[in-house]
């Protein structure tokens, strides 16, 4: 027995039933993608890190989700502490607030 | 105030078991992480392994590969490090730490003893 | 794994004093480094990170430099509360790694 058709990647079991005439064949079929990888070609690649690269957890569709406090499309930028002025502060770790040379204050403003 | 608090440590014999809990307070666990980090008496820094804030993914360091199993219930702001088959080499103070901006954040240890 | 080699891995020095503890990595790791205090019983704490940033409520005697594989933790005048050991760490990929340790010790 063979089938033709699409089967998107699924946890579901899918049933198909096929009846030749001769002998009724009902059998149980999913396709599931390799690890990190999602979506109906099995091409959207998500593998969580906590690093250099990103600060990141991965959705049920393969979609990076930002650890608190990290924002960005790899999550690798920090958010600020709030009221950091956007010109003349900066951070590398969430919640910071460093001033370019020749300002200060708690918002470099 | 991140809190970070370890308990299940204590005497366990080679190829025993143990659980430990890292019970999280002061932030929203799911939006972070946690990692494991063990220290053996008067050695260095080891990192065991880590997992998501939502419980989907854990990684581990090959020395604990299909021994160690890291679990997180979300609802109990909780992690968990599952020891399986734990060797005299496992003996240490075991800390947990959020993930998310370095090691910012640690818990005060757990001491695991592996011994007959 | 990326190793990190810290020297020396003990140091006598007295209060005043200014103090270098060096950290190599096997391989670039650009500024994805951090340095710890540890005292005997008690956690480690972040004292330095993305290789230079001193982290909120650390004092300015310590900063770190460098970039790629060296790096360096200066204390620049050695305070009694200072006799510590202390790590460096990358986080550049996983698995995160640490050196050995570097003991300061009152002379």
């Known amino acids: 027995a063979s089938h033709s058709g699409m089967i998107n990647p699924s946890r579901q079991w899918q049933t198909l039933k096929q009846n030749t005439g001769v002998a009724h064949f009902e059998y149980q079929i999913r396709v599931t993608c390799d690890d990190y990888y999602y979506g109906f070609g099995c091409n959207k690649f998500c593998r969580p890190r906590d690093d250099f690269f990103g600060h990141y957890a991965c959705d049920q569709n393969g979609n990076k989700t930002c650890m608190e406090g990290w924002m960005g499309p790899e999550c690798n930028r920090a958010i600020c502490r709030q009221g950091c002025s956007p010109k003349h502060g900066s951070c590398k770790l969430p919640g910071d607030c460093r001033c370019q040379y020749g300002w200060q204050g708690l918002y470099c403003d | 105030e991140v809190q970070l608090v370890e308990s299940g440590g204590g005497l366990v014999q080679p190829g025993g078991s143990l659980r430990l809990s890292c019970a999280a307070s002061?932030?929203?666990?799911?939006?972070?992480?946690i990692h494991w980090v063990r220290q053996a008496p008067g050695k260095g820094l080891e990192w065991v392994g880590w997992?998501?804030?939502?419980?989907?993914?854990?990684d581990y360091a090959d020395s604990v590969k299909g021994r160690f199993t890291i679990s997180a219930d979300t609802s109990k702001n909780t992690a968990y490090l599952q020891m399986n088959s734990l060797r005299a080499e496992d003996t240490a103070v075991y800390y947990c730490?959020?993930?998310?901006?370095?090691?910012?954040?640690w818990g005060q240890g757990t001491l695991v003893t592996v011994s007959s | 794994d990326i190793q990190m080699t810290q020297s020396p891995s003990s140091l006598s020095a007295s209060v005043g004093d200014r103090v270098t503890i060096t950290c190599r990595a096997s391989?670039?790791?650009?500024?994805?480094v951090a340095w710890y205090q540890q005292k005997p019983g008690k956690a480690p704490k972040l004292l330095i990170y993305?290789?230079?940033f001193l982290y909120s409520g650390v004092p300015s005697r310590f900063s770190g430099s460098g970039s790629g594989t060296d790096f360096t933790l200066t204390i620049s005048s050695l305070q009694p509360e200072d006799f510590a050991t202390y790590y460096c760490?990358?986080?550049?990929?996983?698995?995160?790694?640490f050196g050995q340790g570097t003991k300061v010790e009152i002379k």
């Open positions: 730490a959020r993930a998310g901006s370095w090691f910012a954040y």
């Open positions: 002061g932030f929203t666990f799911s939006n972070y992480g």
């Open positions: 997992i998501t804030g939502n419980g989907g993914y854990s």
């Open positions: 391989q670039d790791v650009s500024t994805a």
């Open positions: 993305s290789a230079s």
């Open positions: 760490q990358q986080s550049y990929t996983t698995p995160p790694t």
